[in-house]
Amino acid sequence: VAFTPYAPEPGGTCRLREYYDQTAQMCCSKCPPGQHAKVFCTKTSDTVCDSCEDSTYTQLWNWVPECLSCGSRCSSDQVETQACTREQNRICTCRPGWYCALSKQEGCRLCAQLRKCRPGFGVARPGTETSDVVCKPCAPGTFSNTTSSTDICRPHQICHVVAIPGNASMDAVCTSTSPTRSMAPGAVHLPQPVSTRSQHTQPTPAPSTAPGTSFLLPVGPSPPAEGSTGD
């Protein structure tokens, strides 16, 4: 077994976790995750590795002269689901009630607040981690009287005697004291999208303003897609 550094056979390749150094023309050791090459190999000495410094990382076996910088702190509309360590970059995902409008390789670059459907409109398609809520007008016989990113259109209560007929944004009002319903009373909620990652991480101080991110998108309730029919 050859020990690094060594000259590869003509036309041969270096082994796993080794790289070919063009200057030394030798197979040399790579540095493991969490470390980087402090001194490159020569014909007589192998790579010298050093640990990644604060807020930098390497995830793979490498021979980079400097570790990669961890991404900036998560903005106020995000949660840190993976902390920056020597071996992994920080991952930011959107808070509940927000979705990822612009993703990056891992985590989210830009979060936007989930659209809220206004009265007369209900959720046709719930928001996910990466897609916004789709609203639809409540069909005849159904209503929604809330501004919500989770409420769907609910059936009007069925009255023996109608005092005020229902419309898209209001339930029917009965004169009798015992209305019946095709569904149980109370708002019907769709679940909020939740992050699939549950890794506990140490807190990272977040800046008071999101650095150059969510100001591009409305931070209040988004106007509903009123012309939308859902699909």
Partner: antibody, heavy 118, light 106 residues
Framework: QVQLVQSGAELKKPGASVKVSCKAS????????MNWVRQAPGQSLEWMGI????????SYAQKLQGRVTLTTDTSTSTAYMELRSLRSDDTAVYYC???????????WGTGTTVTVSS | DIQLTQSPSFLSASVGDRVTITCRAS?????MYWYQQKPGKAPKPWIY???NLASGVPSRFSGSGSGTEYTLTISSLQPEDAATYYC?????????FGSGTKLEIK
């Protein structure tokens, strides 16, 4: 509760070597890097080096390079620090400390007093 | 190596006092870390990532700073806070510690 229990006090003569052990319990040993930090009497803390048990790689403080060797035995979750050619200014309390892959020492060992005296 | 200079090196204050310890770095650092050490004991992590309190640290402690100047503040000194405090950086290899600030209760 993560614990790092170190070996007992040592009295050594100048020129000798010392090997201090640090046994870890209650965590996955290879998931955490092990650092060694020493503290001379009445002095501040001095980082000596780090070992990455997962990969067996090490990095040492320049001033101790060539005199210190860090090793681990993953089967017993034990880290070792050997310091050779001891001098009187090596008299100190030696601590092992994990860093959890971050940049501070979150769990410290019980400490081992090494006295170098003729 | 980055040198960390702590001031003051010794501090005597009364219970209830507001106390500030400063750590100056010879070069800019990303974050500062602080430890508390009592005689005959191993150091305990006290503040990490400049301003986050380690588990079990009372809320009267706080950390702040950036670049080359960082501070540890105790808003209302308590008897159990008597100890030596060390700052530490790892923005550059090797990691280095400050010279320590010994805090005594009057």
């Amino acid at each position: 509760q993560v614990q790092l229990v170190q070996s007992g006090a040592e009295l050594k003569k100048p020129g000798a070597s010392v090997k201090v052990s640090c046994k870890a319990s209650s965590y996955s040993f290879t998931d955490y890097n092990m650092n060694w930090v020493r503290q001379a009497p009445g002095q501040s803390l001095e980082w000596m080096g780090i070992i990455f048990p997962k990969y067996g790689t090490t990095s040492y403080a320049q001033k101790l390079q060539g005199r210190v060797t860090l090793t681990t035995d993953t089967s017993t979750s034990t880290a070792y620090m050997e310091l050779r050619s001891l001098r009187s200014d090596d008299t100190a309390v030696y601590y092992c400390a994990t860093d959890g892959g971050t940049w501070y020492f979150d769990v410290w060992g019980t400490g081992t007093t090494v006295t170098v005296s003729s | 190596d980055i040198q960390l200079t702590q001031s003051p090196s010794f501090l005597s204050a009364s219970v209830g006092d507001r106390v500030t310890i400063t750590c100056r770095a010879s070069s800019s650092v990303t974050y500062m870390y602080w430890y508390q050490q009592k005689p005959g004991k191993a150091p305990k992590p006290w503040i990490y990532l400049t301003s986050n309190l380690a588990s079990g640290v009372p809320s009267r402690f706080s950390g702040s700073g950036s670049g080359t100047e960082y501070t540890l503040t105790i808003s209302s000194l308590q008897p159990e806070d008597a100890a030596t405090y060390y700052c530490q950086q790892w923005s550059s290899n090797p990691p280095t510690f400050g010279s320590g600030t010994k805090l005594e209760i009057k």
